[in-house]
Amino acid sequence: GITNINCSGHIWVEPATIFKMGMNISIYCQAAIKNCQPRKLHFYKNGIKERFQITRINKTTARLWYKNFLEPHASMYCTAECPKHFQETLICGKDISSGYPPDIPDEVTCVIYEYSGNMTCTWNAGKLTYIDTKYVVHVKSLETEEEQQYLTSSYINISTDSLQGGKKYLVWVQAANALGMEESKQLQIHLDDIVIPSAAVISRAETINATVPKTIIYWDSQTTIEKVSCEMRYKATTNQTWNVKEFDTNFTYVQQSEFYLEPNIKYVFQVRCQETGKRYWQPWSSLFFHKTPETVPQVTSKAFQHDTWNSGLTVASISTGHLTSDNRGDIG
């Protein structure tokens, strides 16, 4: 960077090299070049010569003034015009940064994804700081009072093996950068209450084509959690409004959910689960698309035969991994 050059003098910034965005700043350049009484001192920002707001302070020093500086990063250097020198002589350079102090971290959330072996803690960092900001996650056992600290730039994964102080903890986050430091509220957690079941995945769909076509969605999770509540949401790809179906689920069974949908329409399905009564949900599963077949001509019989709902042609969509062969395309 610009800071690695050999200097023949010195450049500095007031109030500081890292400062609050929107401040007025002064950049000073002082030449110390052998056998040179500078005729003129020049400032460059990101390689472009500055032409205004330059004041000569004395024989060797000049000041460049910026009002309301809004650039997150800039490389500054200054040069001198020396008598008998054809080219400008480099004096020194400095990288400067502007940004904001951190906001108070909020929405601190810690979850344990089943089988992951980690407690994952995240938070809302607030507005962009533009400068290097570090976070210290404090985890304090409510049983042993022992506190552990973890340094990170974003979220943190903490091995559950390292949480030896029982089940109850306080978690809080400190955010710090060159412009300030803030601390979140404390989050109280119980390790048994923050487990998110193994991901639920829709594997396939079939529509039994009859007077009222019935679509069966097959889905599963590898969870070992006994009491799991799930939601499946679905909508026509042309619609904005999701319909949501709720379940208390026993994964010792293969899950199959029946829907009576409109014919000849492309639908999208997603599922998510949580341990029953707990706070945190899985993220919604990958989008699963399924198009219902065109309707069979209506049979104008007096009594609608219920078993015709369960007979006839079958139209299927099958998942390959997360996305399906029928899973391409955008949601309208």
Epitope: Q240, D248, Y253, E258, E262
Partner: antibody
Framework: EVKLVESGGGLVQPGGSLKLSCAAS????????MSWVRQTPEKRLELVAE????????YHIDTVKGRFTISRDNAKNTLYLQMSSLKSEDTAMYYC??????????WGQGTTVTVSA | DIVMTQSHRFMSTSVGERVSITCKAS??????VAWYQQKPGQSPKLLIY???TRHNGVPDRFTGSGSGTDFTLTISNVQGEDLADYFC?????????FGSGTKLEIK
């Protein structure tokens, strides 16, 4: 012809229990979600509980959670609702309905549950 | 919970007339609405689902319309046998909820 026949209703004291049954015929019972829907004396309709075709998932409204349990026996083509810790506000006509989601195309004739001291 | 409001508890009409029964959802339910008819002393019967699709065997004088929050069941050429309570139901979100019903009286 689709037929749903409920039984097991009656007069019970608050805190008591009842088990409702619904015998289904005329369709492939084992391949549809089934529900219990109740209608209060004021004629309000309310979905009480729902069970998927293979019994792998269920839904109960919050007011009955922990007190009522829906179950099914596909071999016997029968739907059940086990009701315990009954309250006066559970007094209603209980209907067995098919399919149990998203709407109810077929209803039984209903069985009356009266919770009173 | 989504509240389904049927503002008219009673509606009166004559044979051969056209009547519209309305239902308002407390939030957007898309087109996930069904309508039921319940005649005195009988169980409810499904008339309409997905807002406007008639259930098998339902006469075409029954039509459903609407979307979002406002829904209507229209009976054209009302017949004497249409004397009943009519209920709307949303299945967009759990708990699935019903309107309180509109009693259609024939003059």
């Amino acid at each position: 012809e689709v037929k749903l026949v409920e039984s097991g209703g009656g007069l019970v004291q608050p805190g008591g229990s009842l088990k409702l049954s619904c015998a289904a015929s005329g369709f492939t019972f084992s391949s549809d979600t089934m529900s219990w829907v109740r209608q209060t004396p004021e004629k309000r309709l309310e979905l009480v509980a729902e069970i998927s075709s293979n019994g792998g998932s269920t839904y109960h409204i919050d007011t009955v959670k922990g007190r009522f349990t829906i179950s099914r026996d596909n071999a016997k083509n029968t739907l059940y609702l086990q009701m315990s810790s009954l309250k006066s506000e559970d007094t209603a006509m209980y209907y067995c309905a098919s399919p149990g989601y998203p709407w109810f195309a077929y209803w039984g004739q209903g069985t009356t549950v009266t919770v009173s001291a | 919970d989504i509240v389904m409001t049927q503002s008219h508890r009673f509606m009166s009409t004559s044979v051969g007339e056209r009547v519209s029964i309305t239902c308002k959802a407390s939030q957007d339910v898309g087109n996930a609405v069904a309508w039921y008819q319940q005649k005195p002393g009988q169980s409810p019967k499904l008339l309409i689902y997905w807002t406007s699709t008639r259930h098998n065997g339902v006469p075409d004088r029954f039509t459903g319309s609407g979307s979002g929050t406002d829904f209507t069941l229209t009976i054209s050429n009302v017949q004497g046998e249409d004397l009943a309570d009519y209920f709307c139901q949303q299945y967009n979100r759990y708990p699935l909820t019903f309107g309180s019903g509109t009693k259609l009286e024939i003059k």
